[in-house]
């Protein structure tokens, strides 16, 4: 691969070694100002699969607000507007990073936290080949 | 709103003021093993809307690979398995948190930044505007 | 946990007809109940699927019109009617539930030979 060298305007580091703490500048450069989802499109009321957007919040986690779909129903809405149980209604989901404050309750120093969120829902055809 | 005490044991800031920089221990605590998402679901095959994944690889970022769906198709399948252009494949977004270095190539100095990806399809019924 | 145990095969001439029985205990059938079959050098694959309120909402191509489902939910038990067998019909046959079968099936059964001579 290529090598990009080290700028030399870099802070100083005192451990190389893993587990790795780097300092992080939280004003967020940001490029899309709505961060309400609901606000963003009406995709979840629109969608043969609709969702309900659920408001998670944690303090002791960076970003403290999160929003979780979770699909209306278990079938598809079909052109009748019924629910139809041929098909399935299910959660697109997605791995995220967070900032964890760790030690707890502290202002500056936090751990990345992998959590997966379901961001909203698709209509799939049920499974017919089971992979063993 | 609960004021939760600030942990005697927390590391100390210099600068309390905004840009805030912290520490952040990259020893990422990860619930979920299953990073590529071809693995973790094959919804992306299954679904009425169904989609492509496209690796988005940037070295100057944390993670430096990100999946960005794609729709196949501006309708959704019906089941007969062809494209309905009566409904659309639209792109569910999400804004997620990643790290960006700064200064450039700098291993251990970021600055939070929130960018906005495509996780998934989804079926929805097309807007009808009428004219007065 | 629930268990599912398939009954009711057995060794038939093509043209015959055999009823699977699937019963579940320790819990009742969710949403769904399926069955899926699994041929000698071939994947398992999904031939019937039965909702809760007793509508099929899923037939294979390939048993259409000589295969059927219904589902007894106050004896926790679905069947699979099975007429006009073909040799192509041999199979190891199971039983599954799930809650939502377009993200997988949560509960299996052992699985029951019909076997098809011709």
């Known amino acids: 691969g290529i090598t990009i060298p080290r700028n030399p305007g870099c802070p100083n580091s005192e451990d190389k070694n893993f587990p790795r703490t780097v300092m992080v500048n939280l004003n967020i450069h940001n490029r899309n100002t709505n961060t309400n989802p609901k606000r963003s499109s009406d995709y979840y009321n629109r969608s043969t699969s609709p969702w309900n957007l659920h408001r998670n919040e944690d303090p002791e986690r960076y970003p403290s607000v999160i929003w979780e779909a979770k699909c209306r129903h278990l079938g598809c809405i079909n052109a009748d507007g019924n629910v139809d149980y041929h098909m399935n209604s299910v959660p697109i989901q997605q791995e995220i990073l967070v900032l964890r404050r760790e030690p707890p309750h502290c202002p500056n120093s936090f751990r990345l936290e992998k959590i997966l969120v379901s961001v909203g829902c698709t209509c799939v055809t049920p499974i017919v080949h089971h992979v063993a | 709103g609960i004021t939760i005490p600030r942990n005697p044991g927390c590391p100390n800031s210099e600068d309390k003021n905004f840009p805030r920089t912290v520490m952040v221990n990259l020893n990422i605590h990860n619930r979920n093993t299953n990073t590529n998402p071809k693995r973790s679901s094959d919804y992306y095959n299954r679904s009425t809307s169904p989609w492509n994944l496209h690796r988005n690889e940037d070295p100057e970022r944390y993670p430096s690979v990100i999946w960005e769906a794609k729709c196949r198709h501006l309708g959704c399948i019906n089941a007969d398995g062809n494209v309905d252009y009566h409904m659309n494949s639209v792109p569910i977004q999400q804004e997620i948190l990643v790290l960006r270095r700064e200064p450039p190539h700098c291993p251990n100095s970021f600055r939070l930044e929130k960018i906005l990806v495509s996780v998934g399809c989804t079926c929805v019924t097309p807007i009808v505007h009428h004219v007065a | 946990e629930v268990q599912l145990v398939e009954s009711g095969g057995g060794l038939v001439q093509a043209g015959d007809s055999l009823r699977l029985s699937c019963v579940a205990s320790g819990g009742t059938f969710s949403n769904y109940a399926a069955w899926f079959r699994q041929a000698p050098g071939k994947g398992r694959e999904l031939i019937l699927s039965i909702f809760r309120s007793g509508s099929i909402t899923y037939t294979a191509d390939s048993v259409k019109g000589r295969f059927t489902g219904s589902r007894v939910n106050t004896k926790n038990t679905a069947y699979l009617q099975m007429n006009n067998l073909k040799p192509e019909d041999t199979a190891v046959y199971y039983c599954?539930?799930?809650?939502?079968?377009?993200?997988?099936?949560?509960?299996w059964g052992q699985g029951t030979q019909v076997t098809v001579s011709s």
């Open positions: 599954a539930s799930a809650y939502n079968p377009g993200i997988g099936y949560d509960y």
